[in-house]
Amino acid sequence: LKGQEFAPSHQQVYAPLRADGDKPRAHLTVVRQTPTQHFKNQFPALHWEHELGLAFTKNRMNYTNKFLLIPESGDYFIYSQVTFRGMTSECSEIRQAGRPNKPDSITVVITKVTDSYPEPTQLLMGTKSVCEVGSNWFQPIYLGAMFSLQEGDKLMVNVSDISLVDYTKEDKTFFGAFLL
Amino acid sequence: LKGQEFAPSHQQVYAPLRADGDKPRAHLTVVRQTPTQHFKNQFPALHWEHELGLAFTKNRMNYTNKFLLIPESGDYFIYSQVTFRGMTSECSEIRQAGRPNKPDSITVVITKVTDSYPEPTQLLMGTKSVCEVGSNWFQPIYLGAMFSLQEGDKLMVNVSDISLVDYTKEDKTFFGAFLL
Amino acid sequence: LKGQEFAPSHQQVYAPLRADGDKPRAHLTVVRQTPTQHFKNQFPALHWEHELGLAFTKNRMNYTNKFLLIPESGDYFIYSQVTFRGMTSECSEIRQAGRPNKPDSITVVITKVTDSYPEPTQLLMGTKSVCEVGSNWFQPIYLGAMFSLQEGDKLMVNVSDISLVDYTKEDKTFFGAFLL
């Protein structure tokens, strides 16, 4: 059917059609993070809740060990929001002291890992300088886009600093994907 | 079909398939808000435009009295952006006066109401401290994710302060949902 | 099928069904911008990468000359993220000098152009005041929503200041659309 108008219905090719309710889908929500090792120059990956509350995985989309496993090749919409919170960033303290004020930052990366490829691929990045005047700050970073994924690909969410992630509510920090 | 590769086309099960153009969908846009009562500890819900300009509802997805009504059970992608604007937040004034500087904040919540359950469920929350140096500030909060909804569920968008919502343009503040 | 439950499968109407993998889709990523003319009171449009790296167009969704061309009428989900970065905004400099402090701002607009209609239509806008204390700042603006588009419509992304767009990484600044 690609690249042309639909033929008359008696010529219609039905084979690739599939029930929408049968497509791989997942919505994962934040959990308290347990300290884990991560490589020095690599942002740590978040753990997720996959079944409690609003979280679910279905139709062979499985979550295991920080990764969403892609069960079927196709185009997926992938999204995540991470809410960060912290005390006054060093930036403003440094500024008051008259030293050069390189701002702190918060970053979220949605990363794809393909076993046949040595390096992870960064699919989406949201990064923001944080140089707040107030003593306590909080803010979300939202990401979402469509990508062509292969069966066996793995998705994870990495953040610049796990200790700044707000894990208190499942509606504040989440990660999901669905086959289009 | 769930959990297995597609059988040859002559064995294909067609019953659950449905035309994509037939799925419930809505994109609502901001309107000027009329003052309405809301419970003391609950964020007020926004009114929306459902048919003028870019706004639409279709295929039994109806909008009524601040709510989007879910006409069919399934997995929906739900999204909203609210653009806030205000004068200098009290935070910076308080700070200048040497008082403790708890930051002001802006919050958007997409909430699900189920008649059979007494409490609304918060599906998505975007919350941000506002402690701006400039005298006039403005910024959007965007949310979007997938949820399993039941026929009869109702969706609304709540905000921390209706008076800060930018209602001037339909492209700045909006709310939508569609069945996947 | 609209507005009613599915009839028994032997009565099923198949004509409007179509393979999901056959739907128009595109994910475009940032490239370095070449200076181009734009009308004085109109935000400049971004150029995009359409085939290298994570970028793709498929199923008659084509990219040409800053525009995504819509090949088929229907409801599309459209999204974009633009990451901005800059030096200290004038806002804080003006403030220090005691002059009135109208904040600078950053804005992203997803615009629809219809040949039969003289004026472009702004579908989505994300706009944010920038009044940073730090000397270097960076932050994303994300947008996404569903719109009913017509065959022949063209989509573009406009920004308030091209020189502030971070074009260094394909995961930071992107633009996409897919038929639902």
């Epitope: 347990t34 409690l52 609003l54 208190t168 | - | -």
Partner: antibody
Framework: QVQLQQSGPGLVKPSQTLSLTCAIS??????????WNWIRQSPSRGLEWLGR?????????DYAVSVKSRITINPDTSRNQFSLQLNSVTPEDTAVYYC?????????????WGQGTLVTVSS | DIQMTQSPSSLSASVGDRVTITCRAS??????LNWYQQKPGKAPELLIY???SLQSGVPSRFSGSGSGTDFTLTISSLQPEDFASYFC?????????FGQGTKLEIK
Amino acid sequence: QVQLQQSGPGLVKPSQTLSLTCAISGDSVSSSSATWNWIRQSPSRGLEWLGRTYQRSKWNNDYAVSVKSRITINPDTSRNQFSLQLNSVTPEDTAVYYCAREVVAGPRWFDPWGQGTLVTVSS
Amino acid sequence: DIQMTQSPSSLSASVGDRVTITCRASQSFSSYLNWYQQKPGKAPELLIYAASSLQSGVPSRFSGSGSGTDFTLTISSLQPEDFASYFCQQSYSTPRSFGQGTKLEIK
């Protein structure tokens, strides 16, 4: 440290309702990082998970299919405890009943457990 | 539902022995596997969580390994206080499920 203290009768008549309570100290029944569970142990069935209550965006309950029609688990935020009610009991419900916190932090596990209550169903 | 099959159901060993207990799941779930020790008249106590992480206060002679469907609990050198029953448990999906237990007895 977190402790769970169980209370409730050890003898219940057939067709009546088994009721147990689990008092929590050192944590909150409303914690978003825990679920609050009832588990029973008998020689015939081994360790059998019965159900749980927990709060995320709202209070949620999940129950084992084997007891779903008869079980209720309720949180009591004012007393920081949770309870088990099992209706229409039969002698097959005779077991040691435990309450347990499941820590939810990516991985999840039961810790701590209550001291256990031997419930005998007999007339 | 995920079924957990533990083996052996009972085991006789001596102080100082190295002992291995295995647990097999009916479907794969990576590392969502916990091990508990239970002494007579007492509640189970957590030994190992997430397949291989040692619970605070548990002696280092206990270790866990495995991923997917096959998991192992090893006691490197049995001590008198280790004679008890041991249970595996999956925490990946609801309902939670346990192995039927391994009773470790003195030879």
